[in-house]
């Protein structure tokens, strides 16, 4: 008789999840000499320990702390790029601008990027059929709590000028409910962070509006200012040209506004 299994609203654990995490860990530690000391089997054990045998709607930050401990990594605190709803461009940027880092350029972010996982209460099984959806089921699910935990620590580590890339094509350019809006903004440390600089990425070729005047950007400015952090904003009218100019800053066309 097949055992009854909780049916959640979200997709199940990514197939070959354990193998993927382990393989990503090995690859990352080979590419990044400063992380060569990391024991990937121990990292997987700690990752697994955070959600296996636990109810997938009752995961806490505490559950992930052993993984955080093993994945502790020092990135230059003044070279942090946050992003919201524009992950691909942010990653393309840090692939070119190698001295800047998104969360997914760190070991823990790299391990979990684009993956889904959850377990079942009181069994050592991984649930490949379905996992809780943040809205329809519960917010304290393994994936959401993981990103909340790593995002909080990433933001806490930031210093000097912190950059954030925002999607100017969205109705809410700054969304208080995004990970950036609900976690990272509130965990920047005013005693370390001088300025948050927003880069608003335009979508349309002919879009010449000043999106830094958008009401949601003003809301972000207000939140940041109340935290005693300065705020600045730049429009990136041509993201393709922006990336090209990061690659080739000497190009004559790169002196004009992008």
């Amino acid at each position: 008789v097949p055992r009854w299994r909780q049916q959640w609203s979200g997709p199940g654990t990514t197939k070959r999840f354990p193998e993927t995490v382990l393989a990503r860990c090995v690859k990352y530690t080979e590419i990044h000499p400063e992380m060569r000391h990391v024991d990937c089997q121990s990292v997987w054990d700690a990752f697994k320990g955070a959600f296996i045998s636990k109810h997938p709607c009752n995961i806490t930050e505490e559950d992930y702390q052993p993984l955080m401990k093993l994945g502790t990594q020092t990135v230059p605190c003044n070279k942090i790029l946050l992003w919201s709803r524009i992950k691909d461009l942010a990653h393309q940027f840090t692939q070119v601008q190698r001295d800047m880092f998104t969360l997914e350029d760190t070991l823990l972010g790299y391990l979990a990027d684009d993956l889904t996982w959850c377990g079942e209460f009181n069994t050592s099984k991984i649930n490949y059929q379905s996992c809780p959806d943040w809205r329809k089921d519960c917010s304290n699910n393994p994936v959401s709590v993981f990103w909340k935990t790593v995002s909080r620590r990433f933001a806490e580590a930031a210093c000097d000028v912190v950059h954030v890339m925002l999607n100017g094509s969205r109705s809410k350019i700054f969304d208080k409910n995004s990970t950036f809006g609900s976690v990272e903004v509130h965990n920047l440390q005013p005693e370390k962070v001088q300025t948050l600089e927003a880069w608003v990425i335009h979508g349309g070729r002919e879009d010449s509006r000043d999106l830094c005047q958008d009401p949601t950007i003003k809301e972000l400015e207000s939140i940041i200012s109340k935290r005693n952090i300065q705020f600045s904003c730049k429009n990136i009218y041509r993201p393709d040209k922006f990336l090209q100019c990061v690659k080739n800053p000497e190009d004559s066309s790169c002196t004009s506004e992008i």
Epitope: H37, D39, Q41, S42, D45, A46, G49, E61, E62, Q65, P66, M68, K69, L70, T72, T149, R152
Partner: antibody, heavy 119, light 107 residues
């Protein structure tokens, strides 16, 4: 019966060295993180060092960093603490403790071994 | 200086309920455990993972956690509960840290 038994405590001069051992029995030693915790006379508990289950990761209190080394031999079910450049303030009872699922708590403690640093 | 703060002493009469508190910013995102140390003996785990009791620990001992503080409650106080009580958690560097300890006297 689950047990931890420390040994190696002694009277040593400042600047000297000492190696503490902790033998484990009654559980799968190689599955668990282990810690050293100390208690100076009349004082509270102070965490000293941690080691991961496979021995590949170690962590130290700032007060002992660079002087103490935690290690383990999983084939012998033994935890070690190598203590160099000892100071008077290292005088304490040293306990080894088993970590329950990383960060749940320290669920098994040894009886402690006394280290006295004095000239 | 411990990043977990405990009152140095507490007292109660037999049968009474006493509460020992522990506070510190790192408690918010880390599990809290509690230890009892009877005079001249090694510490013993009383509470793990914020509020759970290991087998063998009487249900007179209970614990809770909220925000940056945690507390241990002992109901039906007995003379053999006279001991030092320590809270522990991981700190912001994810290393163990103990509170300064609370000496419980049964009057």
């Amino acid at each position: 019966e689950v047990q931890l038994l420390e040994s190696g405590g002694d009277l040593v001069q400042p600047g000297g060295s000492l190696r503490l051992s902790c033998g484990a029995s009654g559980f799968t030693f190689s599955d668990h993180y282990m810690s050293w915790v100390r208690q100076a006379p009349g004082k509270g508990l102070e965490w000293v060092a941690d080691i991961s289950a496979r021995g590949s990761n170690t962590w130290y209190a700032d007060s002992v960093k660079g002087r103490f080394t935690i290690s383990r031999d999983n084939s012998e079910n033994t935890l070690y603490l190598q203590m160099n450049s000892l100071r008077a303030e290292d005088t304490a009872v040293y306990y080894c403790a088993k970590n329950w699922n990383y960060n749940y708590g320290m669920d098994v403690w040894g009886q402690g071994t006394t280290v006295t640093v004095s000239s | 200086q411990s990043v977990l703060t405990q009152a140095p002493s507490a007292s109660g009469t037999p049968g009474q309920r006493v509460t020992i508190s522990c506070s510190g910013s790192s408690i918010q995102n880390n599990y809290v455990s509690w230890y009892q140390q009877l005079p001249g003996t090694a510490p013993k785990l009383l509470i793990y993972r914020n509020f759970e009791r290991p087998s063998g620990v009487p249900d007179r001992f209970s614990a809770s956690k909220s925000g940056t503080s945690a507390s241990l409650a002992i109901s039906g106080l007995q003379s053999e509960d006279e001991a030092d009580y320590y809270c522990a958690s991981w700190d912001d560097s994810l290393n163990w840290v103990f509170g300064g300890g609370t000496k419980l006297t049964v009057l």
